[in-house]
């Protein structure tokens, strides 16, 4: 489980078509 103090940070993962982009790359979302 994610620690409580981490919950307001963005989490970054590799994905395709994420973060308003057409290609694959890193995407960070809260």
């Amino acid at each position: 489980r994610r620690r409580r103090r981490d919950t307001h940070f963005p989490i970054c993962i590799f994905c395709c078509g994420c973060c308003h982009r057409s290609k694959c790359g890193m995407c960070c979302k809260t």
Partner: antibody, heavy 121, light 107 residues
């Protein structure tokens, strides 16, 4: 100005441990993901590990997973790399590098000067 | 197991255009970045997201990426551009690949 300064390198015997540090200045450290990248003598670049904004959000290259641990102390503006069970093939210059700002940080936009780690008996 | 392949060396005359390629499986589906490393120095980002230039990087540096090949183009090459160049792309959250590097010689 924006700066990254690595320290902690040196000569170490196989199987031993070493901890590298990277002191950041000139930017809001906690707002950036941070990487370690290494370069063996005369060779190319090899990504080692990244830690994103949350301490729990970190990833490692297969070559170091289970042996190396990346961490950060935002209160000290410092990035760390704890290296255990060192092998001869870990010999390299170790760079810390800042991930780009924003929601799509694909590139490494600021690099430190590097610190040399030599694993030899 | 993915890998990014670059030519070991490229030579160009001053003022001419240098082209450095980086090939990898479905590379065009990922964002490519390029780094310049002068001898004895740390890498410097020159291109990101295939074709974008960071502030302070001269306009003579440009990039493209489609299919299986990303390309770094240096137009009007200068002596100061002599360096090693590395491409880079993400293939997963735990797999950031760099090309083997290309040594650019300005004759």
């Amino acid at each position: 100005q924006v700066q990254l300064v690595e320290s902690g390198g040196g000569v170490v015997q196989p199987g031993r441990s070493l901890r590298l540090s990277c002191a950041a200045s000139g930017f809001t450290f906690s707002s950036y993901g941070m990487h370690w990248v290494r370069q063996a003598p005369g060779k190319g670049l090899e990504w080692v590990a990244v830690i994103w904004y949350a301490e729990s959000n970190k990833y490692y290259a297969d070559s170091v997973k289970g042996r190396f641990t990346i961490s950060r102390d935002n209160s000290k503006n410092t990035l760390y790399l704890q290296m255990n069970s060192l092998r001869a093939e870990d010999t390299a210059v170790y760079y810390c590098a800042r991930a780009q700002e924003g929601i799509a940080p694909d590139a490494f936009d600021i690099w430190g000067q590097g610190t040399m780690v030599t694993v030899s008996s | 197991c993915y890998e990014l392949t670059q030519p070991p060396s490229v030579s160009v005359s001053p003022g001419q255009t240098a082209t450095i390629t980086c090939s990898g499986d479905k590379l065009g589906e990922r964002y490519a970045s390029w780094y310049q490393q002068r001898p004895g120095q740390s890498p410097v980002l020159v291109i990101y997201q295939d074709s974008k230039r960071p502030s302070g990087i001269p306009e003579r540096f440009s990039g493209s990426n489609s299919g299986n090949t990303a390309t770094l183009t240096i137009s009007g090459t200068q002596a100061m551009d002599e360096a090693d160049y590395f491409c880079q792309a993400w293939y997963s959250s735990t797999n950031v690949l760099f090309g083997g590097g290309t040594k650019l010689t300005v004759l």
